[in-house]
Interface confidence: medium
């Protein structure tokens, strides 16, 4: 397993949606055809997998129809988006890149990007 | 986890055409990729073709224009079409399995083509 860099933004906020968009940019060191993307979520030191992807260089991203997450590719950036989220979700986003294919592996974990996400006030009652 | 059986292979001429199956079973709701990589003898094993759950598919250069990757989601098949097949397509073909948390490989099927 050898070490590979991955660069992520250090601060996002979510949108009055829940809606955060980052990207995860690692620095391939060969050429590799298959690369495995996961989301790690770090809050009170427990440590979560959000969601997670592998795509191959030239097609798409795409995570599984369930996933909280999408995404698309573009050379060695990653443009992640994570859905559907509240205040409680608040935490430390971890990009981690795995080069699958070929030989050698490569292994890169990012330094985490702090998602801040307020829930929206609800709307006051109106009366006409 | 995952688990793919290739089968199609077998020797042709150059010039026809052969199509590979693979057949997975086991997790494959994990599935988001499906490939066919090949690998002749003393060389490293190369990425054929590729088709993800949306039905995009990329290939390689050299099969452009000659071979077609299909996947059946309902029958847990991908497919690989290879036609006007040339010598330098003689290798072993293995189906190939990527999701979040799968990175499957089958055993392989043999393909040779005589010129």
């Known amino acids: 397993c050898k070490a590979m860099h991955v660069a992520q933004p250090a601060v996002v906020l979510a949108s009055s949606r829940g809606i955060a968009s980052f990207v995860c940019e690692y620095a391939s060191p060969g050429k590799a055809t298959e690369v495995r993307v996961t989301v790690l979520r770090q809050a009170d030191s427990q440590v979560t997998e959000v969601c997670a992807a592998t795509y191959m260089m030239g097609n798409e991203l795409t995570f599984l129809d369930d996933s909280i997450c999408t995404g698309t590719s573009s050379g060695n950036q990653v443009n992640l988006t994570i859905q559907g989220l509240r205040a409680m979700d608040t935490g430390l986003y971890i990009c981690k890149v795995e080069l699958m294919y070929p030989p050698p592996y490569y292994l890169g974990i990012g330094n985490g990007t702090q998602i801040y996400v307020i829930d929206p006030e609800p709307c006051p009652d109106s009366d006409f | 986890q995952v688990q793919l059986q290739e089968s199609g292979g077998g020797l042709v001429q150059a010039g026809g055409s052969l199509r590979l199956s693979c057949a997975a079973s086991?997790?494959?709701?994990?599935?988001?990729?499906m490939a066919w990589y090949r690998q002749a003898p003393g060389k490293q094993r190369e990425l054929v073709a590729g088709?993800?759950?949306?039905?995009?598919?990329n290939y390689v250069d050299s099969v452009k224009g000659r071979f077609t990757i299909s996947r059946d989601n309902a029958k847990n098949m991908v497919y690989l079409l290879m036609n006007s097949l040339k010598p330098e397509d003689t290798a072993v073909y293995y189906c190939?399995?990527?999701?979040?948390?799968?990175?499957?490989w089958g055993q392989g099927t043999q393909v040779t083509v005589s010129s």
């Open positions: 190939r399995a990527l999701g979040g948390a799968v990175a499957a």
């Open positions: 086991g997790s494959i709701f994990s599935i988001n990729h």
């Open positions: 088709v993800n759950s949306r039905g995009t598919t």
